[in-house]
Protein backbone atom coordinates (compact mmCIF):
# COMPACT_ATOMS: atom_id res chain seq x y z
CA UNK A 1 0.00 0.00 0.00
CA UNK A 2 0.84 3.23 -0.99
CA UNK A 3 1.02 6.51 0.98
CA UNK A 4 0.19 10.04 -0.61
CA UNK A 5 3.62 11.06 -2.52
CA UNK A 6 4.19 7.41 -3.54
CA UNK A 7 5.63 7.32 0.05
CA UNK A 8 5.60 3.64 1.05
CA UNK A 9 4.13 2.60 4.48
CA UNK A 10 6.79 0.79 6.37
CA UNK A 11 6.75 -3.00 6.84
CA UNK A 12 3.95 -4.24 8.80
CA UNK A 13 1.33 -1.18 8.31
CA UNK A 14 -0.83 -0.43 5.39
CA UNK A 15 -2.36 2.98 4.10
CA UNK A 16 -5.39 4.28 5.80
CA UNK A 17 -7.59 6.45 3.43
CA UNK A 18 -10.26 6.55 6.22
CA UNK A 19 -7.45 7.98 8.40
CA UNK A 20 -5.03 9.42 5.83
CA UNK A 21 -1.97 7.43 7.68
CA UNK A 22 -0.13 4.51 8.05
CA UNK A 23 -1.91 1.41 10.18
CA UNK A 24 -0.22 -1.34 12.30
CA UNK A 25 -1.48 -4.13 10.36
CA UNK A 26 -1.18 -5.87 14.17
CA UNK A 27 -4.65 -4.75 14.90
CA UNK A 28 -6.67 -6.18 11.82
CA UNK A 29 -7.16 -9.29 13.53
CA UNK A 30 -8.90 -7.93 16.22
CA UNK A 31 -11.04 -5.86 13.66
CA UNK A 32 -10.95 -6.76 10.10
CA UNK A 33 -13.33 -4.47 8.73
CA UNK A 34 -10.62 -1.38 8.68
CA UNK A 35 -10.37 -0.23 5.42
CA UNK A 36 -6.19 -0.63 5.48
CA UNK A 37 -6.57 -4.14 6.42
CA UNK A 38 -7.02 -4.92 2.74
CA UNK A 39 -3.48 -3.58 2.04
CA UNK A 40 -2.37 -6.05 4.55
CA UNK A 41 -3.38 -8.96 2.97
CA UNK A 42 -1.54 -8.35 0.11
CA UNK A 43 1.57 -6.74 1.74
CA UNK A 44 4.13 -9.32 3.06
CA UNK A 45 4.29 -9.90 7.21
CA UNK A 46 6.33 -7.77 9.23
CA UNK A 47 9.18 -10.16 9.58
CA UNK A 48 9.48 -10.73 5.91
CA UNK A 49 13.19 -9.94 4.44
CA UNK A 50 14.13 -9.56 0.91
CA UNK A 51 16.82 -11.88 -0.07
CA UNK A 52 18.43 -9.58 -2.31
CA UNK A 53 18.68 -5.78 -2.47
CA UNK B 1 -10.80 25.24 24.42
CA UNK B 2 -11.86 23.24 21.97
CA UNK B 3 -15.22 24.32 20.16
CA UNK B 4 -17.67 23.16 17.51
CA UNK B 5 -20.77 25.32 15.96
CA UNK B 6 -23.30 24.11 13.95
CA UNK B 7 -25.19 26.24 11.74
CA UNK B 8 -27.49 26.43 8.97
CA UNK B 9 -30.54 24.56 10.53
CA UNK B 10 -34.30 25.92 9.86
CA UNK B 11 -37.47 24.74 8.24
CA UNK B 12 -37.29 23.37 5.02
CA UNK B 13 -40.17 21.84 2.26
CA UNK B 14 -40.12 18.33 1.81
CA UNK B 15 -37.69 17.77 -1.53
CA UNK B 16 -35.78 20.91 -0.69
CA UNK B 17 -32.24 21.36 0.53
CA UNK B 18 -29.94 22.94 3.37
CA UNK B 19 -26.62 23.14 3.85
CA UNK B 20 -25.04 22.68 7.36
CA UNK B 21 -21.81 24.20 8.76
CA UNK B 22 -19.77 23.13 11.67
CA UNK B 23 -17.10 25.77 12.26
CA UNK B 24 -13.93 24.37 14.64
CA UNK B 25 -11.76 25.74 16.79
CA UNK B 26 -9.41 25.38 19.71
CA UNK B 27 -7.58 22.47 17.79
CA UNK B 28 -6.08 21.92 14.76
CA UNK B 29 -8.67 20.55 12.75
CA UNK B 30 -6.78 18.96 9.59
CA UNK B 31 -5.68 15.58 11.49
CA UNK B 32 -9.08 14.95 12.36
CA UNK B 33 -11.88 12.86 11.22
CA UNK B 34 -15.08 14.32 11.95
CA UNK B 35 -18.81 12.89 11.73
CA UNK B 36 -22.61 14.10 11.35
CA UNK B 37 -24.49 12.70 13.78
CA UNK B 38 -28.56 12.82 14.16
CA UNK B 39 -31.26 13.11 16.61
CA UNK B 40 -34.85 12.66 16.25
CA UNK B 41 -37.00 14.56 18.17
CA UNK B 42 -37.32 12.77 21.61
CA UNK B 43 -35.45 9.70 19.97
CA UNK B 44 -31.78 7.88 20.22
CA UNK B 45 -28.78 8.68 17.89
CA UNK B 46 -27.95 8.20 15.07
CA UNK B 47 -24.67 8.58 13.13
CA UNK B 48 -25.41 9.99 9.41
CA UNK B 49 -21.64 10.36 7.82
CA UNK B 50 -17.74 9.79 8.44
CA UNK B 51 -15.24 12.32 6.30
CA UNK B 52 -11.80 11.38 6.60
CA UNK B 53 -8.76 14.18 7.55
CA UNK B 54 -8.11 15.03 4.17
CA UNK B 55 -11.38 14.60 2.91
CA UNK B 56 -10.52 11.94 0.62
CA UNK B 57 -12.43 9.38 2.10
CA UNK B 58 -16.33 9.36 3.08
CA UNK B 59 -19.32 7.05 3.81
CA UNK B 60 -22.91 7.34 4.84
CA UNK B 61 -25.66 6.02 6.67
CA UNK B 62 -27.86 4.36 3.85
CA UNK B 63 -30.79 6.19 5.26
CA UNK B 64 -29.26 9.14 3.89
CA UNK B 65 -26.75 7.68 1.24
CA UNK B 66 -27.36 9.47 -2.53
CA UNK B 67 -29.03 12.64 -0.73
CA UNK B 68 -26.98 13.71 1.74
CA UNK B 69 -23.26 14.83 1.22
CA UNK B 70 -20.67 15.70 3.65
CA UNK B 71 -17.40 17.81 3.06
CA UNK B 72 -14.59 19.51 4.86
CA UNK B 73 -12.77 22.84 4.00
CA UNK B 74 -9.66 22.53 6.06
CA UNK B 75 -8.09 26.39 5.45
CA UNK B 76 -11.40 27.14 6.80
CA UNK B 77 -11.66 24.87 9.84
CA UNK B 78 -15.07 24.03 8.86
CA UNK B 79 -17.29 20.61 8.29
CA UNK B 80 -20.16 20.81 5.94
CA UNK B 81 -23.13 18.56 5.33
CA UNK B 82 -25.13 19.20 2.01
CA UNK B 83 -28.35 17.82 2.63
CA UNK B 84 -31.30 17.41 -0.63
CA UNK B 85 -34.67 15.75 -1.30
CA UNK B 86 -34.88 16.08 2.47
CA UNK B 87 -37.92 13.79 3.77
CA UNK B 88 -40.10 14.03 6.83
CA UNK B 89 -38.19 11.41 8.51
CA UNK B 90 -35.13 13.64 8.36
CA UNK B 91 -36.15 16.32 10.66
CA UNK B 92 -33.49 16.27 13.84
CA UNK B 93 -31.22 18.13 15.52
CA UNK B 94 -28.14 17.00 13.62
CA UNK B 95 -24.38 16.89 15.90
CA UNK B 96 -20.86 17.18 14.32
CA UNK B 97 -18.56 15.75 16.41
CA UNK B 98 -14.58 15.10 16.56
CA UNK B 99 -12.86 11.89 16.14
CA UNK B 100 -10.33 10.85 18.59
CA UNK B 101 -6.37 11.37 18.16
CA UNK B 102 -5.35 7.67 17.10
CA UNK B 103 -8.11 6.26 15.08
CA UNK B 104 -11.65 7.59 15.23
CA UNK B 105 -12.97 4.92 17.70
CA UNK B 106 -14.26 7.80 19.68
CA UNK B 107 -15.94 11.15 19.56
CA UNK B 108 -14.47 13.37 22.23
CA UNK B 109 -16.07 16.75 21.37
CA UNK B 110 -19.43 17.99 19.95
CA UNK B 111 -21.20 20.90 18.96
CA UNK B 112 -24.32 22.33 20.20
CA UNK B 113 -26.46 20.83 17.55
CA UNK B 114 -28.61 22.24 14.79
CA UNK B 115 -32.33 21.64 14.27
CA UNK B 116 -33.72 20.38 11.04
CA UNK B 117 -37.30 20.46 10.55
CA UNK B 118 -38.93 19.23 7.43
CA UNK B 119 -42.14 20.01 6.90
CA UNK B 120 -45.07 21.48 4.17
CA UNK C 1 -25.07 -4.15 10.94
CA UNK C 2 -24.25 -4.56 14.07
CA UNK C 3 -27.07 -3.66 17.04
CA UNK C 4 -26.73 -2.23 20.27
CA UNK C 5 -29.17 -2.92 22.79
CA UNK C 6 -29.10 -1.32 26.12
CA UNK C 7 -31.05 -2.37 29.34
CA UNK C 8 -33.01 -0.91 30.99
CA UNK C 9 -34.42 1.48 28.60
CA UNK C 10 -35.18 3.96 31.81
CA UNK C 11 -34.75 3.55 35.80
CA UNK C 12 -35.43 5.66 38.58
CA UNK C 13 -32.26 5.98 41.57
CA UNK C 14 -31.72 8.05 44.20
CA UNK C 15 -28.66 10.00 45.06
CA UNK C 16 -26.18 8.15 46.30
CA UNK C 17 -26.90 5.06 44.80
CA UNK C 18 -25.09 2.39 42.66
CA UNK C 19 -26.27 2.30 39.14
CA UNK C 20 -25.57 0.12 36.66
CA UNK C 21 -26.72 0.05 32.78
CA UNK C 22 -25.36 -2.97 30.21
CA UNK C 23 -25.33 -2.79 25.96
CA UNK C 24 -25.47 -5.86 24.54
CA UNK C 25 -23.82 -6.15 20.59
CA UNK C 26 -25.32 -8.26 18.18
CA UNK C 27 -22.31 -10.01 17.47
CA UNK C 28 -18.63 -9.74 19.00
CA UNK C 29 -17.28 -6.50 19.28
CA UNK C 30 -13.82 -7.05 21.38
CA UNK C 31 -13.51 -4.01 23.44
CA UNK C 32 -14.78 -1.18 21.21
CA UNK C 33 -17.52 -0.05 22.94
CA UNK C 34 -17.82 4.04 24.41
CA UNK C 35 -20.01 5.14 26.81
CA UNK C 36 -21.79 8.96 26.23
CA UNK C 37 -24.00 11.14 28.50
CA UNK C 38 -26.85 13.67 27.07
CA UNK C 39 -28.52 15.99 28.90
CA UNK C 40 -31.82 17.50 27.81
CA UNK C 41 -31.22 19.91 25.19
CA UNK C 42 -27.49 19.45 25.10
CA UNK C 43 -24.52 17.34 23.08
CA UNK C 44 -23.51 14.00 23.84
CA UNK C 45 -20.80 14.19 26.56
CA UNK C 46 -17.64 11.15 26.17
CA UNK C 47 -17.49 9.47 29.21
CA UNK C 48 -15.76 6.47 28.76
CA UNK C 49 -14.04 4.66 25.39
CA UNK C 50 -12.49 1.30 24.47
CA UNK C 51 -14.62 -0.32 27.26
CA UNK C 52 -13.20 1.07 30.20
CA UNK C 53 -10.79 4.18 29.62
CA UNK C 54 -12.12 7.14 31.71
CA UNK C 55 -12.16 10.43 29.07
CA UNK C 56 -10.23 13.30 30.49
CA UNK C 57 -12.25 15.11 32.93
CA UNK C 58 -15.11 12.61 33.50
CA UNK C 59 -15.67 11.84 37.67
CA UNK C 60 -13.92 8.48 39.02
CA UNK C 61 -17.27 7.40 39.89
CA UNK C 62 -17.80 6.39 35.96
CA UNK C 63 -16.43 3.35 35.55
CA UNK C 64 -17.03 0.78 32.43
CA UNK C 65 -16.10 -2.70 31.50
CA UNK C 66 -16.97 -5.48 29.52
CA UNK C 67 -15.34 -7.45 26.14
CA UNK C 68 -17.17 -9.17 23.36
CA UNK C 69 -21.02 -8.60 23.34
CA UNK C 70 -21.49 -7.51 26.91
CA UNK C 71 -20.62 -4.32 28.36
CA UNK C 72 -21.46 -2.66 31.40
CA UNK C 73 -21.59 1.36 32.90
CA UNK C 74 -21.48 1.93 36.91
CA UNK C 75 -21.85 4.94 38.72
CA UNK C 76 -20.72 4.02 42.14
CA UNK C 77 -22.64 7.02 43.62
CA UNK C 78 -25.12 8.97 41.69
CA UNK C 79 -24.69 12.41 41.86
CA UNK C 80 -28.02 15.18 41.12
CA UNK C 81 -25.85 15.82 38.09
CA UNK C 82 -25.99 12.60 36.67
CA UNK C 83 -29.82 12.38 35.87
CA UNK C 84 -29.52 12.15 31.79
CA UNK C 85 -29.61 9.87 28.69
CA UNK C 86 -26.59 7.17 28.89
CA UNK C 87 -25.77 5.84 25.02
CA UNK C 88 -23.42 3.08 24.23
CA UNK C 89 -21.47 3.44 20.98
CA UNK C 90 -19.88 0.82 18.89
CA UNK C 91 -17.02 1.31 17.32
CA UNK C 92 -15.92 -1.78 15.91
CA UNK C 93 -17.15 -1.51 12.40
CA UNK C 94 -15.90 2.14 12.31
CA UNK C 95 -16.43 4.81 10.21
CA UNK C 96 -19.90 2.89 10.36
CA UNK C 97 -20.75 3.29 13.96
CA UNK C 98 -24.15 1.99 15.74
CA UNK C 99 -25.49 3.30 19.13
CA UNK C 100 -27.89 1.43 21.78
CA UNK C 101 -31.39 3.12 22.05
CA UNK C 102 -30.23 4.75 25.42
CA UNK C 103 -31.13 4.62 29.22
CA UNK C 104 -32.56 7.70 30.65
CA UNK C 105 -31.78 7.56 34.34
CA UNK C 106 -34.28 9.55 36.55
CA UNK C 107 -35.36 10.96 40.48
CA UNK C 108 -36.47 8.30 42.28
Known amino acids: EQAPGNAPCSSGSSWSADLDKCMDCASCPARPHSDFCLGCAAAPPAHFRMLWP | EVQLLESGGGLVQPGGSLRLSCAASGFTFSPYPMIWVRQAPGKGLEWVSY????????HYADSVKGRFTISRDNSKNTLYLQMNSLRAEDTAVYYCARGGDTYFDYFDYWGQGTLVTVSS | DIQMTQSPSSLSASVGDRVTITCRASQSISGYLNWYQQKPGKAPKLLIYQASSLQSGVPSRFSGSGSGTDFTLTISSLQPEDFATYYCQQSYTSPFITFGQGTKVEIK
Open chain 2, 51 to 58: ISPSGGST
